[in-house]
């Protein structure tokens, strides 16, 4: 028979024959021969391979370095890498999550639109008319101005995006 020029899915061509790739979680030790299938070995502790492969070495699991604010979100297996996330109050600087930075706080005049997670920073928004924020916070939303009317009071000082309105008693009507 003619030697193959292309192989099936999950096979590779070597020495004019198609050999099976190693399954995820295993590395290549010996190519197949005329008499035996490809020899694959399981990845060691703290190693992984996540695809059908012909790698002779497994990859090391990612190390979640606590000195960079990282912690393990999901422990790696022989088929998956470790997933790191950041300690409380911190978030990843990139998709690969190789280091962390402190969550941003929203300045006075701005409120939290979306609270930060381990992988995304705080999203702030300017407080619209009728709302204010007088603190720098990573959690506080813009608060609505106090409604003086519902308290039978009147506005003595208008609110801003950084301050609440100041309510006071209504002027008494003279007879």
């Amino acid at each position: 028979p003619e030697p193959p020029t292309a192989c099936r899915e999950k096979q590779y061509l070597i020495n004019s024959q198609c050999c099976s790739l190693c399954q995820p979680g295993q590395k290549l030790v010996s190519d197949c021969t005329e008499f035996t299938e490809t020899e694959c070995l399981p990845c060691g502790e703290s190693e992984f391979l996540d695809t059908w492969n012909r790698e002779t070495h497994c990859h090391q699991h990612k190390y979640c370095d606590p000195n960079l604010g990282l912690r393990v979100q999901q422990k790696g297996t022989s088929e998956t890498d470790t997933i790191c996330t950041c300690e409380e109050g911190w978030h990843c600087t990139s998709e690969a999550c190789e280091s962390c930075v402190l969550h941003r706080s929203c300045s006075p005049g701005f409120g939290v639109k979306q609270i930060a997670t381990g992988v995304s920073d705080t999203i702030c928004e300017p407080c619209p008319v009728g709302f204010f924020s007088n603190v720098s916070s990573a959690f506080e939303k813009c608060h609505p101005w106090t409604s003086c009317e519902t308290k039978d009071l009147v506005v003595q000082q208008a609110g801003t995006n950084k301050t609440d309105v100041v309510c006071g008693p209504q002027d008494r009507l003279r007879a």
């Epitope: 099936r8 030790v29 010996s30 021969t33 035996t36 299938e37 020899e39 070995l41």
Partner: antibody, heavy 112, light 113 residues
Framework: QVKLEESGGGLVKPGGSLKLSCAAS????????MSWVRQSPGERLEWVAE????????YYPDTVTGRFTISRDNANNTLYLEVSSLRSEDTAMYYC?????WGQGTLVTVSA | DIVMTQSPTLSLPVSLGDQASISCRSS???????????LEWYLQRPGQSPKLLIY???NRFSGVPDRFSGSGSGTDFTLKISRVEAEDLGVYYC?????????FGGGTKLEIK
């Protein structure tokens, strides 16, 4: 050229042990799974053990599991078969083979 | 275990120059999921160790004359010798190396009629 040379056979009493060796040359030994095949006088061939190229995987038929141990030393191109708890029915010529090539065999005789 | 049954079971008398055919049947399929079939044919001449003739059903091993050919699939396999020569005499064995425990056929002795 390829050469496989067995040694270590001999006369042994029932229940006894032996360690067979096979010196390989002329090919990249570590790339090939290796087997031991035996043949009793006037009988068919019987496969008794295989070891993968790295030595990590070993396979045996039920008739010898727990009594025979195949191993290899890739640094010295040598294949081994440790045989223990020997029985009279283990009497045979033991061949070392890569399947493509075979040695001349070493004779194991189990007799009281 | 997979049983390999050869026929003729004991001997096959032939005249030199004739064609000879030996059949081998496995008790279950020896085709792997990736399509490989580890079916081999060996010749053991008197007083010698076995020699590989055919591997993977139909591939002639290096140095084996082209008068030897292998065919078959699934569970039925055949070794053909197109013109028998004196050096071809001996016992022929089929062997399956697809599933552990690997097994040999009982052997067929090719002899002169």
């Amino acid at each position: 050229q390829v050469k496989l040379e067995e040694s270590g056979g001999g006369l042994v009493k029932p229940g006894g042990s032996l360690k067979l060796s096979c010196a390989a040359s002329g090919f990249t030994f570590r790339n090939y799974a290796m087997s031991w095949v035996r043949q009793s006088p006037g009988e068919r061939l019987e496969w008794v053990a295989e070891v993968s190229g790295s030595g990590y995987y070993t396979y045996y038929p039920d008739t010898v599991t727990g009594r025979f141990t195949i191993s290899r030393d890739n640094a010295n191109n040598t294949l081994y078969l440790e045989v223990s708890s020997l029985r009279s029915e283990d009497t045979a010529m033991y061949y070392c083979t890569s399947r493509a090539y075979w040695g001349q065999g070493t004779l194991v005789t189990v007799s009281a | 275990d997979i049983v390999m049954t050869q026929s003729p079971t004991l001997s096959l008398p032939v005249s030199l120059g004739d064609q000879a055919s030996i059949s081998c049947r496995s008790s279950q399929s020896i085709v792997l999921t990736n399509g490989n079939t580890y079916l081999e044919w060996y010749l053991q001449r008197p007083g010698q160790s076995p020699k590989l003739l055919i591997y993977k059903v139909s591939n002639r091993f290096s140095g084996v004359p082209d008068r030897f050919s292998g065919s078959g699939s699934g569970t039925d396999f055949t070794l053909k010798i197109s013109r028998v020569e004196a050096e071809d005499l001996g016992v022929y064995y089929c062997f399956q190396g697809s599933h552990v425990p690997y097994t040999f056929g009982g052997g067929t002795k090719l002899e002169i009629k």
